[in-house]
Interface confidence: low
Amino acid sequence: GLNDIFEAQKIEWHESVRVEQVVKPPQNKTESENTSDKPKRKKKGGKNGKNRRNRKKKNPCNAEFQNFCIHGECKYIEHLEAVTCKCQQEYFGERCGEK
């Protein structure tokens, strides 16, 4: 749904904003600036992202942020233009390193 503005908005998250567990990966300068395509979140039994843009983005979780999350799973949220860690239970902090 509209949450995808945050599942894609993360890429754009400003470096100077200190939001817990958000890290901005290096910008892709060639990325097109304006699109109002409506990416849909995958839902069980629902539409499977059919409106998502075809252009495949490199997921920084598979590259420079591969080992970033200590006790958690790396998540790349496109709109935010950044990486976040989904922490395992009992862990928190930017890299899920605190208990």
């Epitope: 749904g1 979140r41 949220i77």
Partner: antibody, heavy 124, light 111 residues
């Protein structure tokens, strides 16, 4: 202190246009997605538009799509809503709201700060 | 669209008693272990104010007498003990799927 101040509301005839502004202060405006939400005279709240931090992504409900355009100027800490082909059903108090999306590493679609609103009346 | 139905439309509660407001969604608004349902309070002449996010998380600075519960399609806002300053209209808001939708509101009066 986070502040959002809307302006630009007016009385306009059906079919007319209007541009609303929302000036933000007290936070790093460029770091937050923003939305416009309106409240009808019957006190119903309706989401109008959302824009991502870098303005790459914009979202609208079908009721305003093609008529309203949300935009932002991060250098001026200002959010805009250009409204055209206005209808009587667009009469409402228009609020701008800030999205604070991440709590404890999980996304939640929170509109945590709202302005005081600006009134738009569409009538002949 | 996911529609939200709030009930009751209005209620009057005595000071110190419990106020319970229901919000029912036309389909599930859960995703990835969370419910994308928020509660807002609005007083006359003021904008809405966030109380509860993700169904049960209390917003910072909001008194602990406010609590939210529920998942899937059925959600509840409880206020206990009710205080004079709680007289307001309360709205639920779903954002699991666009368009974002708000409930019709529940007006709380303190007796």
């Amino acid at each position: 202190e986070v502040k959002l101040m809307e302006s630009g509301g007016d009385l306009v005839k059906p079919g007319g246009s209007l541009k609303l502004s929302c000036v933000a202060s007290g936070f790093t405006f460029s770091g937050y997605p923003m939305s416009w939400v309106r409240q009808t005279p019957e006190k119903r709240l309706e989401w109008v538009a959302t824009i991502s931090t870098g303005a790459r992504h914009t979202y609208y409900p079908d009721s305003v799509k093609g008529r309203f355009t949300i935009s932002r100027d991060n250098a001026k800490n200002t959010l805009y809503l250009q409204m055209s082909s206005l209808r009587s059903e667009d009469t409402a108090m228009y609020y701008c709201a800030r999205h604070e999306g991440l709590r404890r590493g999980k996304y939640h679609c929170i509109m945590d700060y709202w302005g005081q609103g600006t009134s738009v009346t569409v009538s002949s | 669209d996911i529609l939200l139905t709030q009930s009751p439309a209005s209620l009057a509660v005595s000071l110190g008693q419990r106020a319970t407001i229901s919000c029912k969604a036309s389909q599930s608004i859960d995703y990835d272990g969370d419910s994308f349902l928020n509660w807002y309070q609005q007083k006359p002449g003021q904008p809405p104010k966030l109380l509860i996010y993700a169904a049960s998380n209390l917003e910072s600075g909001i008194p602990a007498r406010f609590s939210g519960s529920g998942s899937g399609t059925d959600f509840t806002l409880n206020i206990h003990p009710v205080e004079e300053e709680d007289a307001a209209t309360y709205y639920c808001h779903q954002c699991n799927e666009d368009p974002y939708m708000f409930g019709g509101g529940t007006k709380l009066e303190i007796r």
